[in-house]
């Protein structure tokens, strides 16, 4: 069950790499975000809050990532044509409830100008 | 962060197929269980409770599965040697809190006697 295409610019290119933006509602305090390439888990990040509001960030599959109050950005480097694929942000919301799982995504097109090391 | 090998018999062979058993504590009411082959999501099942305690079972990646009050079984059929791999049960517990993610697994060995269609 795929909830749909991202309703925002999901891919931001810079310096032969790409930032993949996975948004979540900023009211959400505890969640898991997975980046899927096709059906494969590339990256994931889990944010939980313990007693005393201590925040814990964990990754089962680590990628360079950046967390804000309404998004997780995953960074892929050294782009080549094999990176072209469907990418999905798989969000599991845990707190505040209700528990909700959403999958949104888009196709990453790789053009010559975005490749890491273009042939001169 | 892999929590470890399954401390139970994870693979049950029958009729050229395999039942992969993914256990969860029977106190758990809402969860997501993914079956991973290596780093790839093969199957997943999410159990949530809606208003009026209605139970909802959803799959982003559907496999033949069976849900009990403390396990999810995923069934793979027509086994061949390419099925040999590490398989992981990736459990995300949502209710009751605290939110927790555990990954347990083991290696699926494929022996001649377990293949679907042995050469006579």
């Amino acid at each position: 069950e795929i909830n749909g295409s991202a309703n925002y610019e999901m891919f931001i290119f810079h310096n032969g790499g790409v930032q993949i933006l996975c948004k979540y509602p900023d009211i959400v305090q505890q969640f898991k975000m997975q980046l899927l390439k096709g059906g494969q888990i590339l990256c994931d990040l889990t944010k939980t809050k313990g007693s005393g509001n201590t925040v814990s960030i964990k990754s089962l599959k680590f990628c360079h990532s950046q967390l804000s109050n309404n998004s997780v950005s995953f960074f892929l480097y050294n782009l080549d044509r094999s990176h072209a694929n469907y990418y999905f942000c798989n969000l599991s919301i845990f707190d505040p409830p209700p528990f909700k799982v959403t999958l949104t995504g888009g196709y990453l097109h790789i053009y010559e100008s975005q490749l890491c090391c273009q042939l001169k | 962060e892999i929590n470890g090998s399954a401390n139970y018999e994870m693979f049950i062979f029958h009729n050229g197929g395999v039942q992969i058993l993914c256990k969860y504590p029977d106190i758990v009411q809402q969860f997501k269980m993914q079956l991973l082959k290596g780093g790839q999501i093969l199957c997943d099942l999410t159990k949530t409770k809606g208003s009026g305690n209605t139970v909802s079972i959803k799959s982003l990646k559907f496999c033949h599965s069976q849900l009990s009050n403390n396990s999810v079984s995923f069934f793979l059929y027509n086994l061949d040697r390419s099925h040999a791999n590490y398989y992981f049960c990736n459990l995300s517990i949502f209710d009751p809190p605290p939110f927790k993610v555990t990954l347990t697994g083991g290696y699926l060995h494929i022996y001649e006697s377990q293949l679907c269609c042995q050469l006579k």
Partner: antibody, heavy 121, light 106 residues
Framework: QVQLVQSGAEVKKPGSSVKVSCKAS????????MHWVRQAPGQGLEWMGL????????NYNQKFQGRVTITADKSTSTAYMELSSLRSEDTAVYYC??????????????WGQGTTVTVSS | EIVLTQSPATLSLSPGERATLSCSAS?????MHWYQQKPGQAPRLLIY???KLASGIPARFSGSGSGTDYTLTISSLEPEDFAVYYC?????????FGQGTKLEIK
């Protein structure tokens, strides 16, 4: 069916406190968070804050920070909103609203009937 | 704080006519929700996630928009549609409502 039933109207003196209740039925109380929203006479709606019932985490609108306290009693499936140091401009209808999510955002899917609080000397 | 400005403040139309209500955000938001409120009643969810129809809401209601500009459309007004309509954004803290558009019978 899913219902949120709020306590009755209150008349309060400036400087005092008021505690409004919201009793949930028709669903598992801990499976959803609860928001509070208010509406002053002839005015628009204003989000005050929420409580995540099972974790007790709260999130308040900074405008009310320090004056509002949202709590919940799981045993009676009741959420509470207490507002202290009342002034005349706190005269409003106070609503509880249940949290829900779409694919992208969150919203209030079920509302209480409202509780009128009048602050007057 | 993200300010939501609804226009017009009052809209006078007859049953059967088409109503278009606007909501403009002071900065970009990811989605908009719409609520209907009748006198003496609590608000009722109409549209969530910009364009999704809430449970039990008739198909004559629709929502659209992105960024800072969002619209609620009622294709053919029924007598029970005359009420106050509020837009709401939950993508930027503190979460805010528009001041409302009153839809009245001409």
């Amino acid at each position: 069916q899913v219902q949120l039933v709020q306590s009755g109207a209150e008349v309060k003196k400036p400087g005092s406190s008021v505690k409004v209740s919201c009793k949930a039925s028709g669903y598992t109380f801990t499976d959803y968070a609860m928001h509070w929203v208010r509406q002053a006479p002839g005015q628009g709606l204003e989000w005050m804050g929420l409580i995540s019932i099972y974790s007790d985490h709260t999130n308040y609108n900074q405008k009310f920070q320090g004056r509002v306290t949202i709590t919940a009693d799981k045993s009676t499936s009741t959420a509470y909103m207490e507002l202290s140091s009342l002034r005349s401009e706190d005269t409003a209808v106070y609503y509880c609203g249940r949290n829900n999510y779409g694919n992208y955002g969150w919203y209030f899917d079920v509302w209480g009937q409202g509780t009128t609080v009048t602050v007057s000397s | 704080e993200i300010v939501l400005t609804q226009s017009p403040a009052t809209l006078s139309l007859s049953p059967g006519e088409r109503a278009t209500l606007s909501c403009s955000a002071s900065s970009s938001v990811s989605y908009m929700h719409w609520y209907q409120q009748k006198p003496g009643q609590a608000p009722r969810l109409l549209i969530y996630d910009t364009s999704k129809l809430a449970s039990g809401i008739p198909a004559r209601f629709s929502g659209s928009g992105s960024g800072t500009d969002y619209t609620l459309t009622i294709s053919s007004l029924e007598p029970e549609d005359f009420a106050v309509y509020y837009c709401f954004q939950g993508s930027g803290y503190p979460y805010t409502f528009g001041q409302g558009t009153k839809l009245e019978i001409k």
